[in-house]
């Protein structure tokens, strides 16, 4: 992975259990740059250093993720650790992982996006809704939308609520949901692609 991600992981793995807990709490209230969402509290508090690093990088990308981590460490009084993190990230450009490319799934665009074509089946059959919400939060879901979906009592009603927001999404936003579905319930996506 990139240098910045490794540096974030090093810093978080060097925190005591108590410091890591404090770090997460501070992360819930630290000021964020415009356009960035907050990692959901429920998901955040249960994460270990590795999961938290991945979450920071997926939510804030490597450069800003490292900067944000350093700011929180500094706020905790861990100036030396914050300095080491920033020094480590400035040594290199935070080169991106090679990333083995999956075969393109959507070379030709049909009239309707996959998630619109299979709306009814997805409402009925998606079980891992919380995972989807975490993948979409801060990207295509606002805090209010995230909370509104979570508040629904059943998986189908959660998915129905999620689908109430999709008319305002463009094609690439819908691709993010499809990508999250592939990662969380690939068998379901494969089944629907065959149907």
């Amino acid at each position: 992975m990139g240098r910045a991600r490794d540096a974030i992981l090093d810093a978080l793995e060097n925190l005591t259990a108590e410091e890591l807990k404090k770090f997460k709490l501070k992360l819930l209230s630290v000021p964020l740059r415009e356009g960035y969402g907050r990692i959901p509290r429920g998901a955040l508090l249960s994460m270990d250093a590795l999961d938290l690093t991945d979450k920071l990088v997926s939510f804030y990308l490597e450069t800003y993720g490292a900067e944000l981590t350093a700011n929180v460490l500094r706020d905790m009084g861990l100036q030396e650790m914050a300095g080491q993190l920033q020094a480590a990230t400035h040594q290199g450009s935070g080169a991106a992982p090679a990333g083995i490319q999956a075969p393109p799934q959507s070379a030709a665009k049909p009239g309707l996006h996959f998630i619109d074509q299979h709306r009814a089946a997805l409402i009925a059959r998606v079980t891992n809704v919380e995972w989807l919400l975490d993948a979409l939060y801060g990207k295509v879901l606002t805090d209010e939308q995230y909370q509104a979906v979570r508040a629904e009592p059943t998986n189908p009603s959660k998915m129905r609520k999620l689908f109430s927001f999709t008319p305002a999404w463009n094609w690439t936003c819908k691709d993010l949901l499809l990508q999250a579905l592939r990662e969380s319930q690939s068998y379901l996506v494969e089944d629907l692609e065959r149907s």
């Epitope: 080169a95 999956a102 990207k139 690439t172």
Partner: antibody
């Protein structure tokens, strides 16, 4: 500072092939979707192809489908456009574009590379 | 495909004048519209995204508005360096489509 630098320009005969590259620096390339857009001699802009950050979503305009292939190498921070069976109407300035999440708006443009298809 | 009809195709305006360029989509594009400026000999530059969001570093005299099918770009007080060609783009669905462009010249 974000930089996108296209290369591969050339004069090609109809039916010929050409590969364009776009070297990217100044940000974590693998996090962003990219597109190729071309500008015809009449100054009309046409979107050509799109590739998502991980390469798993790819889209083309109908007129290039089956002839052009967009790809990326996230380890080399480079975007590619392989063009084959070129036609005179493919003559244009080709730009690579970095698109920002989540809705993939066009944030940064390269300086462009000229492709001329002529007998 | 979504067709983007941009008007006018060319116009002359005086320095300090308020200028408005419009773009009409053939269907609702839910504000997934960008505006670009191209100065002669240069690459296009993004001014506005999501119909009304100004890109960092773009002067505040530029603004975007609209919804549904109808969108506009306004320059509140024209300056000399604003001369060039302006394009709109819908990125609601693939294929992305551009307007035909508006050539803006100084009177």
């Amino acid at each position: 500072d974000v930089k996108l630098v296209e290369s591969g320009e050339g004069l090609v005969k109809p039916g010929g092939s050409l590969k364009l590259s776009c070297a990217v620096s100044g940000f974590t390339f693998s996090n962003y979707a990219m597109s190729w857009v071309r500008q015809t001699p009449e100054k009309r802009l046409e979107w050509v192809a799109y590739i998502s950050s991980g390469g798993d979503f790819i889209y083309y305009r109908d007129t290039v489908k089956g002839r052009f292939t967009i790809s990326r190498d996230n380890a080399r921070n480079t975007l590619y456009l392989q063009m084959s069976s070129l036609k005179s109407e493919d003559t244009a300035m080709y730009y690579c574009i970095l698109q920002l999440r989540p809705e993939a708006w066009f944030a940064y443009w390269g300086q462009g590379t000229l492709v001329t298809v002529s007998a | 495909d979504i067709k983007m009809t941009q008007s006018p195709s060319s116009m002359y305006a005086s320095l300090g004048e308020r200028v408005t360029i419009t773009c009409k989509a053939s269907q609702d594009i839910k504000n997934y519209l960008s505006w670009f400026q191209q100065i002669p000999g240069k690459s296009p530059k993004t001014l506005i995204y999501r119909a009304n969001r100004l890109v960092d570093g773009v002067p505040s005299r530029f603004s975007g508005s609209g919804s549904g099918q109808d969108y506009s770009l306004t320059i509140s007080s024209l300056e000399y360096e604003d001369m060039g060609i302006y394009y709109c783009l819908q990125y609601y669905e693939f294929p992305y489509t551009f307007g035909g462009g508006t050539k803006l010249e100084i009177k």
